[in-house]
């Protein structure tokens, strides 16, 4: 969490946002809150990127004024424009890309004051592992996939029974690049595995942790899987 | 040159399915949003569906749980699987990209006709 | 829901004369996800602004787009005969994803 104060001349206001991640390919929010005017009219919100000559966004007088906008975002960016009133200026990002990672400045003025606060965007790629029985092998075998990450993760094999034990001897995990040339489908095998027992396919990059869990008795499988975001640090 | 292209319309009786195509060239389809957008016979546009680079999906819910949109990124080519169709998903079917310019690349379109 | 609404339905004007559609938006629509086509008959549409008011690549200048919140605008400064056409209004982000206006026809007066 970054909590950001005003600067000199008017009063300050308390700006803060939340260090975040975007998943390539999908849309993205970078978090942005700040103490709230009565007036909407009051409101101006900018949000700059290191290094970008350009504004990302701005919003003033209650509406979009993209005139100072980059070229790098025309076309991507949008205000929730009825929760400005309330103290969000959090920004929508279409299309999220690599070359979106970096430090964003969320810059606000309002009757009370201006405020600012960086926040730290991350960018890659994280999916769901799917943990299966893979029937095709000559022995117990379970094949866990994840369609898309970037950049490259760590996979670790665990199991509920035999808890601490080292899988890596008895595991194989590949990589394969996707048709974008950017992000990879990771692939990973674990040999030799017992009946009733849970096994967990851990992932694991910089930006995201995911996990798929199966459990295998004689009479049925049970799946389940979750993911976290691992930078949410707000500012 | 950036180009779609699209194939798989026809005349079909109601409660039937059809898969359309939409064949892609000079840009890969799964960098961007890709849409399916119809037009029935005399009227206006009408958004079905959409797939994100990141391989989510959204749908009109006009077509949920009846339309499925996929791609092949070997193929690099879109496709909307149609099941139960009815009379009123009678229209042209336009695949279209959105490159966060709006939907910038249509293809020709493809008639879908559903009549007994 | 978002319901874009486009007016007049059919606007009727000669070569020359300037025109101006109108989109209305339900609830506010961002100014990047607002964009307006161009359709003439047994054609796919053509993408002619985005960003509220940006113009897309090959479109001449005559065309413009303004607006901002709930109300837009498209202005076509001089008709030329290949104008006459029906213009949709389209925007991005809210429920549904994607929403068209009905449509306003220019036709030759």
């Known amino acids: 969490l970054i909590i950001g104060f005003g600067i000199s001349g008017r009063h300050s206001i308390t700006v803060t946002t939340v260090a975040s991640a975007g998943n390539i390919g999908e849309d993205g929010i970078l978090s942005c809150t700040f103490e709230p005017d009565i007036k909407l009219s009051d409101i101006v919100i900018q949000w700059l990127k290191e290094g970008v000559l350009g504004l990302v966004h701005e919003f003033k007088e209650g509406k979009d004024e993209l005139s100072e906008q980059d070229e790098m975002f025309r076309g991507r960016t949008a205000v929730f424009a009825d929760q400005v009133i309330v103290g969000n200026a959090s920004l929508r990002l279409k299309n999220v890309q690599l070359t979106d990672a970096g430090t964003y400045k969320c810059y606000i003025i309002t009757s009370k004051g201006k405020g600012n606060a960086n926040l730290e965007y991350k960018t890659g790629a994280f999916s769901m592992p799917e943990v299966n029985v893979d029937y095709n092998a000559s022995s117990e075998t379970l094949r866990c996939e994840a369609p898309r990450w970037f950049p490259q993760p760590t996979v670790v094999w665990a199991s509920q029974v035999d808890q601490g034990a080292n899988f890596s001897e008895v595991s194989n995990t590949s990589f394969e690049l996707n048709s974008e040339n950017v992000t990879m489908k990771v692939v990973s095998v674990l040999y030799n595995v017992t009946i009733n027992n849970t096994y967990s396919c851990m992932i694991e990059n910089d930006i995201a942790k995911a996990t798929g869990d199966i459990k295998v008795t004689e009479s049925e499988i049970k799946r389940r899987s979750h993911l976290q975001l691992l930078n949410s640090k707000a500012s | 040159e950036v180009q779609l292209v699209e194939s798989g319309g026809g005349l079909i009786q109601p409660g039937g399915s059809l898969r359309l195509s939409c064949a892609a060239s000079g840009f890969i389809v799964s960098r961007n949003y890709m849409n399916w957008v119809r037009q029935a016979p005399g009227k206006g546009l009408e958004w079905v569906s959409v797939?994100?680079?990141?391989?989510?999906?959204y749908y009109a819910d006009s077509v949920k749980g009846r339309f499925t949109i996929s791609r092949d990124n070997s193929k690099n080519t879109l496709y909307l699987q149609m099941n139960s169709l009815r009379a009123e998903d009678t229209a042209v079917y336009y695949c279209?990209?959105?490159?966060?310019?709006?939907?910038?690349?249509w293809g020709q379109g493809t008639t879908v006709t559903v009549s007994s | 829901e978002i319901v874009l609404t486009q007016s007049p339905g059919t606007l009727s004007l000669s070569p020359g004369e300037r025109a101006t559609l109108s989109c209305r938006a339900s609830q506010s629509v961002s100014s990047s996800y607002l964009a307006w086509y161009q359709q003439k008959p047994g054609q796919a549409p053509r993408l002619l602004i985005y960003g509220a008011s940006s113009r897309a690549t090959g479109i001449p200048d005559r065309f413009s787009g303004s607006g901002s919140g709930t109300d837009f605008t498209l202005t076509i400064s001089r008709l030329e005969p290949e104008d006459f056409a029906v213009y949709y209004c389209q925007q991005y982000g809210s429920s549904p994803l994607y929403t068209f206006g009905q449509g306003t026809k220019l036709e030759i007066k």
């Open positions: 279209a990209r959105d490159a966060d310019y709006g939907l910038d690349v």
């Open positions: 797939i994100y680079g990141s391989g989510r999906t």
